[in-house]
Interface confidence: medium
Amino acid sequence: KSSNEATNITPKHNMKAFLDELKAENIKKFLYNFTQIPHLAGTEQNFQLAKQIQSQWKEFGLDSVELAHYDVLLSYPNKTHPNYISIINEDGNEIFNTSLFEPPPPGYENVSDIVPPFSAFSPQGMPEGDLVYVNYARTEDFFKLERDMKINCSGKIVIARYGKVFRGNKVKNAQLAGAKGVILYSDPADYFAPGVKSYPDGWNLPGGGVQRGNILNLNGAGDPLTPGYPANEYAYRRGIAEAVGLPSIPVHPIGYYDAQKLLEKMGGSAPPDSSWRGSLKVPYNVGPGFTGNFSTQKVKMHIHSTNEVTRIYNVIGTLRGAVEPDRYVILGGHRDSWVFGGIDPQSGAAVVHEIVRSFGTLKKEGWRPRRTILFASWDAEEFGLLGSTEWAEENSRLLQERGVAYINADSSIEGNYTLRVDCTPLMYSLVHNLTKELKSPDEGFEGKSLYESWTKKSPSPEFSGMPRISKLGSGNDFEVFFQRLGIASGRARYTKNWETNKFSGYPLYHSVYETYELVEKFYDPMFKYHLTVAQVRGGMVFELANSIVLPFDCRDYAVVLRKYADKIYSISMKHPQEMKTYSVSFDSLFSAVKNFTEIASKFSERLQDFDKSNPIVLRMMNDQLMFLERAFIDPLGLPDRPFYRHVIYAPSSHNKYAGESFPGIYDALFDIESKVDPSKAWGEVKRQIYVAAFTVQAAAETLSEVA
């Protein structure tokens, strides 16, 4: 439970007072306010929203609210030279062109500055050639094409369906396969749930709807021109040729009406199996090129987008801690959107706004948290997590010494079925305890706890009677805090039923149809799921900032470390002969995990018993908890990914959205049977086992008794 002794306030100012102050009606009002016009990063509209949020957070009662600006590389379509794709005949005449914009939703016909669908950071170019259908453009899809089907993508334009993995990984894979252009499209199999109408009559994607998004492979670098350092006014900027993570081939997204026109003519090889078929009435032939009658026709891309150094603005609000002002708990979510941002990000920003208002109300009544709370409205998340990363780069020395926790607050909903949480194992017990205290908003669970409905609908695959909590991957603003700086992090939102809904994300993701009405009519008319997410995010922040002993349980890290070690060992054991030949042993890793488990257990015992009235000892124990996540950071980073420094978790090299455990070992083992120099490859596996074992042992020792 929270304790208020140290903050000198009346008993009514506890977690309950904070939670009771959160109101669904306010979240609804804020969401409406934030979604009436587009707030694209780098635009005047988004700057004005930053100033509005700054002003309102000041009114709510924060101690200070500042704008932090950076000049970063962004990407925009050319207003006078639109991007499109055409089918051309043998004379070079364009016989079909893809649409230049999405038909605007009802009520938004006269809104200006709706950016047309584009792939941010695509280079300019007008490649033409034969088409190859590459399914989701995952690593395994290209293996299937190249190794099994012997189809060469070199010099071809590939068409890939959105879903399963981050779009930047798709583009990287296509580049490595030698493609000269990429067309991304939304297949109804992934973005049209059966039995639901398309927008505006339901929450499904219409044929003219298109998903925008960046196609970078930044690997945590932030601004492509200033990796590792803030993009301030005196930054040394790389030239575009040396920029980090930019794609080298033109890329453009389309909807399924336009995709139908391209895919219906495909010839060449038949799809290898049913997993390559979507829901369009087309054969899903792989190609290359068009079938018989159309074999002389080609596809041509016309991409004229430009990369521009542009000013962005974060809003940073501070609520100073009464007892430990030099310990920071951060709640952050982005403000920039592709268009209206009805879900992404404003359903999250509206929740943050209400959380700030509630904290401000308590502060006006004389309360302060024990630790400092920082609130952030990040800019340019959609362009590669740029606002959060630049701010963290600028403040890295403070953050690595003072950062207790980071709670992310992007979209509050991606469905309305149950809770979804991804976090460090240190927060498992905090999340469990908190959700047991909150009421479930779900139908059929009236009077029951959120923990109960969540556990029933999303059970843990390992532990019965517990809910699923996932690993942190990336694709959101916690990345720099967790993967680079080693600050304990977590995120929570309401999600869909993954069992019955096989589509990727939510259908209208990053389209013009992501409006206030989408949320208010179809996802959460009562805003009860938004309120629940506000209670979870806000409750986590409250506990992290206010509990006398940090609500971290190091024993949960011990449990997952053993699980991850078992998993990576079993992957390696698929190659028993090579392990023997090259003397590959996991003994050091298992030994380190065993030591960690024992030391964590002893630390937890001491945590129960120590004298909490001794401020020095209290601070010492809390610091050991705070710095445990930091202890998993390797200053040298992962191979070829210097900004991914967490040894236990990193975004998957094949899907930025997904988290991988023991990523150094995992990547060293990946596809090892195809490596040209097996001795060198297995040597790298051994080195990565050593790094992991050392890091786990070193982390364990931070929990030992200090003297």
Epitope: D71, E233, R237
Partner: antibody
């Protein structure tokens, strides 16, 4: 956006020069300000910059003689140059500094170094 | 620091003519960081073309810029009387910022 320089006009050799640049239409907490000079009939020479956070950079040949300061609340930037010689006679401009460009310029103030 | 050499130093052309002036850098400059300014007599310079090829607000479409590496150019497709001025290129490849000596464009 407007920038306006004001200076003494005439400075005696070996004396120091002080010029004030008053800006409007933007905040000095958001943008830096560069100083540039142009001797009569000659080209442009970049002198230095004060960025929004107060950090400065001075062009090497002038580093020992130059200082740039500002008062954000008054929207003013100050250039001070010591030990002036006749070849420091020039039109002195302030300009808003935006990612390595000067996107808005003042009308300039003429400085003559003469006894 | 990077030295910019503009050529010609002075040029004259008739209205309607196509005009090109060049700016050469002593070491490679990113196209993102090469800019042009126009200065008319007894007036302050104006940002004219930024990041090699982007026209500043209010600049007529007859102006264009191009180049990469060490060689850049400013072109006027059809000269008009109001274009008579001195044009300076300016670069960043690390501080200090430097200007070229200028190309003075006169009308015949």
């Amino acid at each position: 956006v407007k920038l306006q320089e004001s200076g003494p006009g005439l400075v005696a050799p070996s004396q120091s020069l002080s010029i004030t640049c008053t800006v409007s239409g933007f905040s000095l907490t958001d943008y830096g300000v560069s100083w540039i000079r142009q001797p009569p009939g000659k080209g442009l020479e970049w002198l230095g910059v004060i960025w929004s956070d107060g950090n400065t950079y001075y062009n090497s040949p002038l580093k020992s003689r130059l200082s740039i300061n500002k008062d954000n609340s008054k929207s003013q930037v100050f250039l001070k140059m010591n030990s002036l010689q006749t070849d420091d006679s020039a039109m002195y401009y302030c300009a808003r500094h935006k990612v390595y460009t000067m996107d808005y310029w003042g009308q300039g103030t003429s400085v003559t170094v003469s006894s | 620091s990077t030295v910019l050499t503009q050529s010609p130093a002075i040029m004259s052309a008739s209205p309607g003519e196509k005009v090109t002036m060049t700016c050469r850098a002593s070491s490679s400059v990113s196209s993102s960081y090469l800019h042009w300014y126009q200065q008319k007599s007894s007036a302050s310079p104006k940002l004219w073309i930024y990041r090699t090829s982007n026209l500043a607000s209010g600049v007529p479409a007859r102006f264009s810029g191009s180049g990469s590496g060490t060689s850049y150019s400013l072109t006027i497709s059809s000269l008009e009387a109001e274009d008579a001025a001195t044009y300076y290129c300016q670069q960043y490849s690390g501080y200090p910022l430097t200007f070229g000596a200028g190309t003075k464009l006169e009308l015949k």
